[in-house]
Structures are given as structure tokens and as C-alpha cells.
């Protein structure tokens, strides 16, 4: 008895795809080994078709996949696109080679069913309408006319020309005549339930005169399309219900046993395991809309249904869409903080991951609000304006090559709290969503400026210090003069070697940036942080307004000013004469081509300063002891 | 709520052939699995035969002791899945469950159904 187990037989007709679930004992060794699927020839051998190292045959090419599942030890071989060759003996095992460990599986293709010629064969999915149609001779023009199913040797009226009407397709038939037409009548039968598949016999006229013609309803249950995942990466459903139901509530709903529970509907229905992680997007006027989930959980695999009607729930004959999704736990994307805790005044750095392949790519921060069908305002990006209500406070660290980007928000509020999506404007899968909690602060933040009322006055020369605890003391201090483009980070100056942290002086760690003479354009937000290597972490910032020296203001030595500064026993100072370039960014339009839930913020009408790179600062100031 | 009903029980002889039909009532999906299994007193309930179809698509599995002795099949227009077996043998013997699913999983695994029928027995006599 092989421990490979699977289907033995699997039927299927000309045209349609097959899933082959193959289930192999839970070993380690199982689940890192070659799979196969290969077909078993009149001579013994059997030619691999695929293979989860890599290999497609030509007769697979484009048509067939083969996806490992280690998590439940199985495996999946997908083939589309069926014809009559492909009946045959199959196996699927495990192994370097096809004589290991396998299971047979037979495989039968079928052309589409025939019917006596006299038959007319109409094929419908769910939901939707079909139209019979029926001939009759002249001499039964004003017969009566009808049309019943067979059930065994006996036809059920369904509707007939003297408004007689099933009960159980009642407001669902009509039967009519169109323009002057007197051979033809029609029965159309709306919202096609399963039960309504079999013969119809339409009829006019009564005994040996009577004109007869069958007609074959087939009534399609959506067969659904599957959709492999990767965990924390994302998916996007699309859904086409047609233009007859451009107008009804649209729904996506998870099959939970016989029901389906709606996971988010255009009336505003949400499941909650879904928050933050959610869009739903109409496409066009026409019924088509998407469904995207990002942050894929494992509890997340199942049958979906899309589907519309004017409740936004499922209901049973309305048209649908199926797909099963399937979730990969052996995921490329990396796991990453999924809930970020910050306090009112203080900040949070934000590490968002994403395909290493694509350092080129450029990267987005939206803030996911759950109004009406849910949407994603960009607040910051790599070549992004930031959204007003931002500036100052918000900043996008880009490390090429790492595989991540940095988000930095400070200045926290309560109102910050919320959802966020991490995203570029390559490989989509890579979304990340974080949950960010704001609580109310307890304690004085750990990172404080003075002076806090950050006045400069052209022409003079400008210091702010930035103070920071001893468990900052191993950590890279830096100030940054804060754009529309980023946080461009100051030259900086350390003199002499520090003292031991043993003996750090909680009271006085300051880093000190000087601005020498100050210029106009030195106006704007500052940020000081600290960082360890491309790992950024606490930040705080200050606004330094600059204003004309009005006459008869004293003028402000520069010994006096960093007089502070120089007493200061571990101190780092900077300085700084930064120039900006003007220059307007905008975002890429190509990056959610087809996903306008995630709104642009680069389309602002207004023209934004981004700075350059910062020169390089002469004549620090400031000691170390 | 789906309902399934076993039916088609009864004593035969070894050698002999039964016909067991499952009917299933209530709302269906278009993908679903329905499974045989059968218990023999004081045992545990053992997989025979399953069924599951997406679409067009139909899939069957079988217990390695009853492959070509037992079919499975589905019968649309009357919402059934009929189990025929032929050459039963004493060891056949037991009461006959259904259970249905819509989800994919593994068809041996009794875990696998949502729903399930009340059993039919059958007993083969030598």
C-alpha cells in the first residue's frame, strides 16, 4: 500500500482545468523532496510532465502548475485546458526519481455531451437568464402555448400562455412573443437556481398536432478559480458579475460550512478579522469591482464568493464568482511587526520589507481608512509629496539593497492610531500592514530640544541641542533638516573619544546642531534622532522659524549661544549651511494603474521644496571631554 | 443547515451486491466532497470511498480494500451519491455513514466533514 494517497480516478471534459491533490506522510524529508507528476507509458516508463524543481514539459507549457504545500503535507497539480489526449494513466510521488514512492491516478477527458438533434442545448451559470426558444407551424398560432420539465416519464407545466406559473418560478418566467413574429414564442427564466438544470419540452398546440421542442438547460455552479498565496503577501479578487447587476450592492463572503459569511460589501459591512487589511474597489460602471486583502494569514485559505444583490448578501440564485484561495506558510516575505506601540509626542520607526529584487522600485506609506468600502490615502513616498497634516513630522528612510524601507512618523497623536499599508510599485504581493497604537504618554519623551520656542535670525549664528538618555549613549545621534522628500540627514562632527558609558551622565548626553550663518532658507522642521547602523530609531523634531534682525536687537554673540553647548561634557555638534533645490515630485502613475483605492498624493496641485543633498558644514563648534 | 440521508441497507451474501444512496438537501456549493465510511461494531469509523467535484470536474478516491469492488458516483438531477458494491465480503460489514464538506481537505480523515448522515447498516452473511 503506497503512503502517497490521492484521487483514482478524476473525469473531466474537453476545455476545463483539474486540481490533483496529492497527500504524502508529514516528514521532513517529504516535504523538502521532489514532486512529480508524470504519465505512464505502454512500456513501463513514466515521463515527468512537472516537477517542483523547475521542470514543464512541452505538452504542459503554459497550461499546468505543481505547488508544494510542506504545511499539510500535500501537494497540488493544476492542468487547463483539457482535451481527449490528455486521457490516461498518471502518477504523482515523491522522489529523485519516478520510481519512488507514487500513486496511480487515471485521468478520463470527455468531449462535451451531444444531444438528439432535435434538442437544443442552452448552458447558463448561476444567477443569470435564459431564453428558450420555441418554433411552431402556423396552424398552432393561436394555440395555447407552454412549456414544462421532465420529471421521470412526466412534464411539469412551468408557465403557459394562460398566466399559469409554477410557484417555484413565480416572478422568475415569462413567456412572450416578439414583434409580429407567429412561428416562434420565447420563455425567458431569470435568477437560475441548480434545481432548474434538465429537459424543458415547449409545446404549441394540443394531441398529434401539437408542436414540440426540447431543450436542455445545463445551469453551471461556479467553478472556482484557485488562487496560490504566500502568507503576509496579498490578493486581489476580480470580480465581473455583468451589467445586470451594475446597480445592486456588490459582496465578497467566505464559505463558512452552508452559509457564507460576507467579509465586506458596498453597504458598509466589514468583518472585523479583515480591519486595516481590506479594499474593495469598483472598476467601472458596469458591475465590475475588486476585492484586495493584504497581510495573508493562514486562517485566511477557503472558498470566496463574490456576488451581488441589493441586501449585499448572498442570495441564492444571483450571479457569482468563486475562487479557492490557498495559503503557502512557506512565504519569501518576510515576518515583520505587525502592531507598532507609540506614545502622544513621541515617534515610531517603521521597518517596511519588500522584494530585494526590486531595490529600484519606489516605495509608498497610505494610511488605510475603513470609510465606506475602505481606501488608502498615500501619505509619504519615495517620489511623493507628503500629505498635508505630515510635514514635518513624517519621513521615508529608502535603504537600496536591504530589502526594507524605513517610515518614520513622530509628533504622535492619538488620532494616528490606525492601519497602515506598507507597499511599491513592483511585485504586489509584498504589502505589509501595521497596526499603530498611540497611547497617551506617561513620561517626558527621551529625546528633548531646547530651546523649544527655536527662533534663528538671519545672518547669526543659530544652536539647538538635542537631549537624549544614557540608553541612546552607544547609539548614532543625528539631525536631519526635514523636506518634502525626506529627512536629509546634517555633516556631523565628533571630537575626541567618548567617555565610558559606566559613567554616563544622565543629565548631560547632547548632540548640537549649529546653523553659521544663518539664511532664509534655513527656515523649516529639524529632527533629531538616533540610529544604529540602517536600523533608525527614536526621533523628535523642532520647527526653526527664521526672521530679519530688527534694529536695535541685540546681536547675539555666537559664544553666547553655544556657551551651553560647550559645557557639555559628551557632545556631538553639527552644522550646517544646507541648500535646497527646487524641485516638484509626483507619483508615479504607473503604480496603482488598476488600483485606484489607494489614493495618489502626488497629484497636489502645490509646489513643494524637496532638498538636495546636504553640503557639507564648516566651522562645528561644540566640544567633547 | 445540509441534511444527508443514508439508505440502501440490509443483509446480503457474501458475493454478492447492495446499492447505498446518500441524498443531501439544503443549500450546496459548486465545489464539494461527499465521503463513505463505515463502522463495524466496537471499531473506529474507516474511510471507503469519496467523491468531490468542482464545475465539470470529478475526483473519487477509494480504500485500497475495496478498489475495484466498490463506485462511487453523483447523480445531479436527484442529489445523490450513490455507493454501488459488488462482491461484498463478511468484512464489509458495518454501519455505512455519508458526511459532506465544501471545504477541501483530506477525504480519509473523518475531521475532514461538516455534515453527516445517520448510518445505514449492512451486514454481509457467509
Known amino acids: 500500500q503506497s503512503p502517497i494517497f490521492g484521487p483514482q480516478d478524476v473525469s473531466s471534459i474537453e476545455g476545463n482545468s483539474v486540481s490533483i491533490t496529492c497527500y504524502y506522510p508529514d516528514t521532513s524529508v517529504n516535504r523538502h523532496t521532489r514532486k512529480y507528476w508524470c504519465r505512464q507509458g505502454a512500456n513501463g516508463y513514466c515521463a515527468t510532465l512537472i516537477s517542483s524543481n523547475g521542470y514543464l514539459s512541452k505538452e504542459y507549457s503554459g497550461r499546468a502548475s505543481l505547488i508544494n504545500f510542506p504545511e499539510n503535507s500535500t501537494f497540488v497539480i493544476n492542468i487547463a485546458h483539457l482535451t481527449q489526449e490528455d486521457t490516461g494513466s498518471y502518477k504523482c510521488g515523491l522522489g529523485t526519481t519516478n520510481r519512488g514512492l507514487f500513486f496511480d491516478v487515471s485521468l478520463e477527458v470527455s468531449q462535451v455531451p451531444e444531444f438528439p438533434n432535435d434538442t437544443h442545448v442552452y448552458t447558463k451559470d448561476i444567477g443569470r437568464t435564459v431564453t428558450i426558444e420555441c418554433r411552431f407551424k402556423e396552424g398552432n398560432a393561436h394555440s395555447k402555448k407552454s412549456l414544462c420539465k421532465k420529471r421521470g416519464e412526466a412534464c411539469e407545466v412551468v408557465i403557459d400562455s394562460t398566466e399559469y406559473v409554477d410557484p417555484s418560478y413565480k416572478d422568475r418566467a415569462i413567456l412572450f412573443m416578439k414583434g409580429t413574429s407567429r412561428d416562434i414564442f420565447y420563455v425567458n427564466i431569470s435568477h437560475l437556481i441548480p434545481s432548474d438544470a434538465g429537459l424543458y419540452v415547449c409545446q404549441a398546440g394540443e394531441g398529434p398536432s401539437a408542436d414540440k421542442n426540447n431543450a436542455d438547460l445545463q445551469v453551471l455552479e461556479p467553478e472556482p478559480e484557485l488562487l496560490y498565496k504566500d502568507l503576509r503577501s496579498s490578493v486581489t479578487f476580480e470580480c465581473d458579475l455583468g451589467r445586470e447587476v451594475a446597480n445592486d450592492a456588490k459582496y465578497l463572503c467566505r464559505k463558512n460550512k452552508e452559509t457564507c459569511d460576507v467579509i465586506i460589501n458596498t453597504l458598509g459591512k466589514r468583518d472585523p478579522a479583515f480591519e486595516g487589511r481590506i479594499l474593495l474597489t469598483p472598476r467601472d460602471d458596469n458591475g465590475r469591482f475588486s476585492v484586495l486583502i493584504t497581510g495573508l494569514r493562514k486562517e485566511d485559505a477557503g472558498h470566496y464568493q463574490c456576488g451581488a444583490h441589493s441586501s449585499g448578501l448572498p442570495q441564492e440564485g444571483w450571479p457569482v464568482q468563486a475562487w479557492q484561495l490557498f495559503v503557502n506558510e512557506e512565504s519569501t516575505i518576510p515576518n515583520s511587526r505587525s502592531v507598532v506601540k507609540g506614545v502622544t509626542g513621541g515617534s515610531v520607526a517603521i521597518v517596511c520589507p519588500y522584494n530585494p529584487k526590486e531595490s529600484s522600485s519606489l516605495k509608498y506609506w497610505c494610511h488605510w481608512e475603513a470609510d465606506e468600502n475602505g481606501r488608502c490615502p498615500v501619505l509619504v513616498g519615495t517620489q511623493a509629496l507628503v500629505q498635508e497634516g505630515y510635514e514635518g513630522r513624517l519621513a521615508l528612510f529608502d535603504q537600496p539593497g536591504s530589502g526594507a524601507y524605513t517610515v518614520i512618523l513622530n509628533q504622535l497623536t492619538t488620532q494616528d492610531s490606525g492601519f497602515y499599508w506598507c507597499l511599491t510599485d513592483g511585485d504586489s504581493r509584498w504589502r505589509t500592514t501595521i497596526e499603530l497604537q498611540v497611547a497617551e504618554a506617561t513620561k517626558k519623551p527621551d529625546l528633548e530640544v531646547t530651546p523649544q520656542n527655536a527662533t534663528a535670525v538671519i545672518g547669526e549664528t543659530f544652536t539647538i541641542s538635542c537631549h537624549y538618555p544614557c540608553k541612546f549613549y552607544s547609539q548614532e545621534k543625528y539631525w536631519c533638516k526635514w523636506s518634502n522628500d525626506g529627512c536629509h540627514i546634517l555633516p556631523s562632527h565628533d571630537e575626541g573619544a567618548r567617555q565610558s558609558s559606566v559613567s554616563c551622565d544622565q543629565s548631560s548626553q547632547i548632540v548640537s546642531m549649529t546653523l553659521n550663518p544663518v539664511k532664509k532658507e534655513d527656515e523649516g522642521w529639524y529632527w533629531c534622532g538616533v540610529k544604529e547602523g540602517q536600523v533608525y530609531g527614536e526621533t523628535t523634531a523642532i520647527y526653526v522659524a527664521v526672521e530679519e534682525r530688527t534694529r536695535g536687537s541685540p546681536h547675539i554673540n555666537p559664544t553666547d549661544a553655544n556657551a551651553r553647548a560647550k559645557d557639555a561634557p559628551e557632545e556631538e555638534a553639527m552644522e550646517s549651511s544646507v541648500r535646497e533645490d527646487e524641485n516638484k515630485a509626483n507619483l508615479d502613475p504607473r503604480l496603482f494603474a488598476d488600483e485606484r483605492e489607494i489614493q495618489n498624493a502626488g497629484d497636489q496641485a502645490q509646489e513643494n521644496r524637496a532638498s538636495g543633498n546636504a553640503g557639507s558644514a564648516g566651522g562645528q563648534s561644540g566640544s567633547s571631554k | 443547515e445540509v441534511q444527508l440521508v443514508e439508505s440502501g441497507g440490509g443483509l446480503v451474501q457474501a458475493g454478492g451486491s447492495l446499492r447505498l444512496s446518500c441524498a443531501a438537501s439544503?443549500?450546496?456549493?459548486?465545489?464539494?466532497?461527499m465521503g463513505w465510511f463505515r463502522q463495524a461494531p466496537g471499531k473506529e469509523r474507516e474511510f471507503v470511498g469519496a467523491?468531490?467535484?468542482?464545475?465539470?470536474?470529478?475526483?473519487?478516491y477509494y480504500e485500497d480494500s475495496v478498489k475495484g469492488r466498490f463506485t462511487i458516483s453523483r447523480d445531479n438531477a436527484k442529489n445523490t451519491v450513490p455507493l454501488q458494491m459488488n462482491s461484498l465480503k463478511p468484512e464489509d460489514t458495518g454501519v455505512y455513514f455519508c458526511?459532506?464538506?465544501?471545504?477541501?481537505?483530506?477525504?480519509?480523515?473523518?475531521?475532514?466533514?461538516?455534515?453527516w448522515g445517520q448510518g445505514t447498516l449492512v451486514t454481509v452473511s457467509s
Open positions: 467523491i468531490s467535484w468542482s464545475g465539470s470536474s470529478t475526483y473519487k
Open positions: 458526511g459532506g464538506t465544501m471545504e477541501r481537505r483530506d477525504p480519509r480523515r473523518t475531521s475532514a466533514y461538516d455534515y
Open positions: 439544503g443549500r450546496t456549493f459548486g465545489s464539494y466532497s
